[in-house]
Interface confidence: low
């Protein structure tokens, strides 16, 4: 469930503290409920950048776990189609700390509406 | 030991501040293009221990046309379905990577 996703995000936050990753990532900080799946897709895609740039197996594994888990939950809710939403590349780029904070917020949105 | 000039990436530029070993540099997508979500602009000067030659790692960067500019032309509305985002997992390797 989404609680497991939160715990994996917390682990990623913990693991990156000792690393210098200066990447900026597409971040939706004000998610509209009718575009939450689209926004979640962008977060999951950008998470792979953290995995790639960290070079850390533990981060890679945690990212992979999180993506698989989130995809399982999304697909179990059926094929939801959203239109009129921003593409990932239209979003503002923010630092990793802000990205992860916004990611936690969107997961909480999913928890609150499930 | 230093790295040679980095490879070119389509629709991107790089201004290298340092060619020394372990330097980390970033490509920047050209005007009118954006980094494709999920790709990394990072390249690092690393040493090939077998040959003792330094080289830049290959970035996963893809620069795509800025969707805001593309939208100025008539185009179908952007839609998304819940098909999954697929990670590219590393396979288990028989030896540790440093």
């Amino acid at each position: 469930n989404w609680v497991n996703v939160i715990s994996d995000l917390k682990k990623i936050e913990d693991l990156i503290q000792s690393m210098h990753i200066d990447a900026t990532l597409y971040t939706e900080s004000d998610v509209h409920p009718s575009c939450k799946v689209t926004a979640m897709k962008c977060f999951l895609l950008e998470l792979q950048v953290i995995s790639h740039e960290s070079g850390d197996t533990d981060i890679h594994d945690t990212v992979e776990n999180l993506i698989i888990l989130a995809n399982n939950i999304l697909s179990s809710n059926g094929n939801i189609t959203e239109s009129g939403c921003k593409e990932c590349e239209e979003l503002e780029e923010k630092n990793i700390k802000e990205f992860l904070q916004s990611f936690v917020h969107i997961v909480q949105m999913f928890i609150n509406t499930s | 030991i230093t790295c040679p000039p980095p490879v070119s990436v389509e629709h991107a530029d790089i201004r290298v501040k340092s060619y020394s070993l372990y330097s980390r540099e970033r490509y920047i997508c050209n005007s009118g293009f954006k980094r494709k979500a999920g790709t990394s602009s990072l390249t690092e000067c690393v040493l090939n221990k077998a040959t003792n030659i330094a080289h830049w790692t290959t970035p996963s960067l893809k620069c795509i046309r800025d969707p805001l500019l593309a939208r100025q032309r008539p185009a179908p509305p952007f839609t998304v379905t819940t098909a999954g985002v697929t990670p590219q997992p590393e396979s288990l390797s028989p030896s540790g990577k440093e």
């Epitope: 497991n4 990156i16 000792s18 197996t57 533990d58 | 997992p89 396979s91 288990l92």
Partner: antibody
Framework: QVTLKESGPVLVKPTETLTLTCTVS????????VHWIRQPPGKALEWLGV???????DYNPSFMSRLTISKDTSKSQVVLTMTNMDPVDTATYYC???????????WGQGTTVTVSS | EIVLTQSPGTLSLSPGERATLSCRAS???????LAWYQQKPGQAPRLLIY???KLASGIPDRFSGSGSGTDFTLTISRLEPEDFAVYYC?????????FGQGTKVEIK
């Protein structure tokens, strides 16, 4: 070539603190996590905890109050400290390297610890 | 915590026979994060299968893993003399990581 080797006391008295060291080679402790697992005589394997590449730790709740895992990356060593040892803690203690999918692809040969007065 | 129950406790078979070992989880093992290890007397465990069905490096292909959710199986298609050992399953779906109690495969 990846190797892990546990070292420490063979005999520990009840209430004493056990300190075991896992010395590794062939991989970097800043990249790969190391798990500690134990196996009482004739029994199953029991996971104790893990120290991640970045230094954070996860422990089995059953041992959380008396277990500490730390590392000295410069010496390529991981240290397990377990306080208030009891005869039921008599076991072979293993350290093992973490791999993708949270499995242990390389193990030390194990060190047998007996808790007795 | 997730409890893994292995069956049978002991499997008595002859070389050349097929061995089927079961591992049942008390809750669903998400992402099929289940592994199998082989342990011989006086030795450390050796990784055989990871992610339920992927063969670890250097492991002969007579070993295979299958299953998802709560039911997992390790199959040894044709037992070789060196395959007689104890086999453990292990999960990482949630903390703490847990192992099954083991299945001993002995020579009949």
């Amino acid at each position: 070539q990846v190797t892990l080797k546990e070292s420490g006391p063979v005999l520990v008295k009840p209430t004493e603190t056990l300190t075991l060291t896992c010395t590794v080679s062939g991989f970097s402790l800043t990249t790969y996590a190391v798990h500690w697992i134990r196996q009482p005589p004739g029994k199953a394997l029991e996971w104790l905890g893990v120290i991640w590449g970045a230094g954070s730790t996860d422990y089995n709740p059953s041992f959380m109050s008396r277990l500490t895992i730390s590392k000295d990356t410069s010496k390529s060593q991981v240290v397990l400290t377990m306080t208030n040892m009891d005869p039921v803690d008599t076991a072979t203690y293993y350290c093992a390297k973490n791999a993708a999918y949270y499995v242990m692809d390389y193990w030390g040969q194990g060190t047998t610890v007996t808790v007795s007065s | 915590e997730i409890v893994l129950t292995q069956s049978p406790g002991t499997l008595s078979l002859s070389p050349g026979e097929r061995a089927t070992l079961s591992c049942r989880a008390s809750q669903s093992v998400i992402y099929s994060y289940l592994a199998w290890y082989q342990q011989k007397p006086g030795q450390a465990p050796r990784l055989l299968i990871y992610a339920a069905s992927k063969l670890a490096s250097g492991i002969p292909d007579r070993f295979s893993g299958s299953g998802s959710g709560t039911d997992f199986t390790l199959t040894i298609s044709r037992l070789e003399p060196e395959d007689f050992a104890v086999y453990y399953c292990q999960q990482r779906a949630s903390y703490p990581l847990t192992f099954g109690q083991g299945t001993k495969v002995e020579i009949k």
